[in-house]
Amino acid sequence: HNTTVFQGVAGQSLQVSCPYDSMKHWGRRKAWCRQLGEKGPCQRVVSTHNLWLLSFLRRWNGSTAITDDTLGGTLTITLRNLQPHDAGLYQCQSLHGSEADTLRKVLVEVLADPLDHRDAGDLWFPGESESFEDAHVEHSISRSLLEGEIPFPPTS
């Protein structure tokens, strides 16, 4: 798998999308996990609804949300109030039994808020020692959900 880079601004929301073959992964729940080291395990952050038919319902774990368009074949992860420590390597996964197939490897980069003049020295970027060959960069611009805004699924 190639690695897709998603860049977001500190303090804002970042939306990560993972497209997949909707028939190949029919009936399978999905998950978002964080890679612990280059060869380490992928630690589950959040997974879609326990009932696959309700995968369109957004599920949260802390500041991370997941929702799955099972017909269109797009898994969407929202990282709210992005922080420097959110930067790193993640995976979108398709679950079957106790196993997981990787749908996409994702490198999250956190950019300094241009309106925030505090020291940006602690913001994370991949160092030269870390190689992500053939990485594809996607700039994601998103907004935070307004207070009280309920993320209903599309009706059509």
């Epitope: 028939m23 190949k24 029919w26 009936g27 696959w52 079957h96 039994g97 196993e99």
Partner: antibody
Framework: EVQLVQSGAEVKKPGESLKISCKGS????????IGWVRQMPGKGLEWMGT????????RYSPSFQGQVTISADKSISTAYLQWSSLKASDTAMYFC????????????????WGQGTLVTVSS | DIQMTQSPSSVSASVGDRVTITCRAS??????LAWYQQKPGKAPKLLIY???SLQRGVPSRFSGSGSGTDFTLTISSLQPEDFATYFC?????????FGQGTKLEIK
């Protein structure tokens, strides 16, 4: 009606090559994984591997990896199991089966089976 | 690989009897288990999936239970057509593995 129709019985000599087939009908062939299962005479069932005809993604059992090749031609809704050099120990009944994912539990089960292809390898 | 062990390997029973076959996994497989019936010279047939869900068209006298490592297939009242060999299979992980089979014979 979902149907998997396998090719006929084969008698081969050790060292010969062979390709058996499994044709699916009555459903969208490219939307389901197809598995192959071996049953040696008087024995149990052994899962060999599986293929997703939509993109030919394939998984093998470690016991069969390198021993057989699983392929598919989606244009004719057919999956294949092949050997490049048969051994006497390959004598068995071979079944293809559709793997259907059950959305209740996100795993898949063999819900439709071919009638089996008997392969006999003898000098 | 996950090992699946069935017991007994064979059982003799009469029409109308209640029969229970057990299957044990070498490690926890949640409820990712199937039961199949196979008659001589025929392909296996799916009876139960997800440990306890009855496949469409299968008579209600068949039922499955269990989770984790221990599972059972129960036939509440044996019919003549039920005499066959039964296999369990784990759908937890690759490689998929089957039990060695339980042959159900007429007493």
């Amino acid at each position: 009606e979902v149907q998997l129709v396998q090719s006929g019985a084969e008698v081969k000599k050790p060292g010969e090559s062979l390709k058996i087939s499994c044709k699916g009908s009555g459903y969208s062939f490219t939307s389901y994984w197809i598995g192959w299962v071996r049953q040696m005479p008087g024995k149990g069932l052994e899962w060999m591997g599986t293929i997703y005809p939509g993109d030919s993604d394939t998984r093998y059992s470690p016991s069969f990896q390198g021993q057989v090749t699983i392929s598919a031609d989606k244009s004719i809704s057919t999956a294949y199991l092949q050997w490049s050099s048969l051994k006497a120990s390959d004598t068995a009944m071979y079944f293809c089966a559709r793997q259907r994912t059950m959305y209740y539990d996100s795993s898949d089960y063999f819900d439709a089976w071919g009638q089996g292809t008997l392969v006999t390898v003898s000098s | 690989d996950i090992q699946m062990t069935q017991s007994p390997s064979s059982v003799s029973a009469s029409v109308g009897d209640r029969v229970t076959i057990t299957c044990r996994a070498s490690q926890g497989i949640s409820s990712w288990l199937a039961w199949y019936q196979q008659k001589p010279g025929k392909a296996p047939k799916l009876l139960i999936y997800a440990a306890s869900s009855l496949q469409r068209g299968v008579p209600s006298r068949f039922s499955g239970s269990g989770s984790g490592t221990d599972f059972t297939l129960t036939i509440s009242s044996l019919q003549p057509e039920d005499f066959a060999t039964y296999f369990c299979q784990q759908a937890d992980s690759y490689p998929r593995t089957f039990g060695q089979g339980t042959k159900l014979e007429i007493k």
